[in-house]
Interface confidence: low
């Protein structure tokens, strides 16, 4: 099942949206998220702890939208119209992996299983919502 399927029931029973509190994920084009996120973290604090591991990579700048992509999984966009978190689309993931995985290897990192691009929707459509690369994130 792809992440981000549209729910006509408008999120009945889903956790409410909450303000993005993770410093790395502020000012990226949306400001509401929902927990648990797409990686199973139940709180933003828990998500932030893992996300911080990528800080050197974001600073390195291997991919212009890496921060946006990571935040789309760790603090995915939330809207009251959709019951599930909305991740980035697969092409953004694949570009980030292509450019950043070789750099990660230099830092003794492997590209994490949790960032498996195959789990993400191929493109944004009403049946599998996802976010395209932003203009200026």
């Amino acid at each position: 099942l792809e992440i981000g399927r549209f729910d006509p029931e408008r999120g009945r029973g889903a956790a409410p949206c909450q303000a993005v509190e993770i410093p790395m994920c502020r000012g990226i084009g949306y400001n509401l998220t929902r927990m648990p996120n797409l990686l199973g973290h139940t709180s933003q604090g828990e998500a932030a702890a893992e996300l911080a591991e990528f800080a050197p990579l974001v600073q390195y700048g291997c991919h212009s939208h890496l921060r946006f992509f990571l935040c789309s999984l760790y603090a995915p966009m939330c809207t009251d119209q959709v019951s599930t978190p909305i991740p980035a689309c697969r092409p953004m993931c694949e570009q980030a992996r292509l450019r950043c995985a070789p750099i990660m290897e230099q830092f003794n990192f492997g590209w994490p299983d949790s960032l498996d691009c195959a789990r993400l929707p191929t493109r944004n459509d009403p049946h599998a919502l996802c976010m395209e690369a932003p203009e200026n994130a």
Partner: antibody, heavy 118, light 107 residues
């Protein structure tokens, strides 16, 4: 390349606490992940927990939850591991190491022997 | 938690011979597995990360392979300084876990 230097050996009484330090030099400390791993005499390696200094957020192995506190001082690039309610089975060499989530451990500190004995 | 089982517990090998060490995970760890060497009285030293990538300064006689649940560390021609204990470790999920170790001793 980061280098990690640990504090010296400690002898403690059962029920007391110990605080071991790990000073980093030669690389980014704040955005690193610093883990603590222990090794009882003649035994294997056991992960205790880790901290990301820039966040101050620590994760602990379930076994040590409630007894261990890992902290970091960014101003001195030093990580600390405090273990309380010590018992004889806590006698071990405690290592700090860089890494600990999606990352292997490298480098390692030289180790600190903590002996718990009455 | 993910359990890593190393085999054999002890491996007796003559210098110059090939040594093959195994590490099996109770569930998939992808390629997020490392190998360490530890000599008496010393801290562990990273040999292999990402299941197959040699760490900086590690001789080419050390190689790692595998993914998922089955991993192998191979030392192609044992030197005297290679006799030590070897540990595998997964960094795919919490809690981080180590294998129990394989001791490589002189035959």
């Amino acid at each position: 390349q980061v280098q990690l230097v640990q504090s010296g050996a400690e002898v403690k009484k059962p029920g007391s606490s110990v605080k071991v330090s790990c000073k980093a030099s030669g690389g980014a400390f704040s955005t690193s992940s610093i883990s603590w791993v222990r090794q009882a005499p003649g035994q294997g390696l056991e992960w205790v927990g880790r901290i990301i200094p820039v966040l101050g957020t620590a994760n602990y192995a379930q076994k040590f939850q409630g007894r261990v506190t890992i902290t970091a001082d960014e101003s001195t690039s030093t990580a600390y591991m405090e273990l309380s309610s010590l018992r004889s089975e806590d006698t071990a060499v405690y290592y700090c190491a860089k890494g600990g989530w999606r990352s292997s451990f490298d480098p390692w500190g030289q180790g600190t022997l903590v002996t718990v004995s009455s | 938690e993910i359990v890593l089982t190393q085999s054999p517990a002890t491996l007796s090998v003559s210098p110059g011979e090939r040594a093959t060490l195994s590490c099996r995970a109770s569930q998939s760890v992808s390629s997020n597995l490392a190998w360490y060497q530890q000599k008496p009285g010393q801290a562990p030293r990273l040999l292999i990360y990402g299941a197959s990538t040699r760490a900086t300064g590690i001789p080419a006689r050390f190689s790692g392979s595998g993914s998922g649940t089955e991993f192998t560390l191979t030392i192609s021609s044992l030197q005297s300084e290679d006799f030590a204990v070897y540990y595998c470790q997964q960094y795919n999920s919490w809690p981080l876990t180590f294998g129990q170790g394989t001791k490589v001793e002189i035959k």
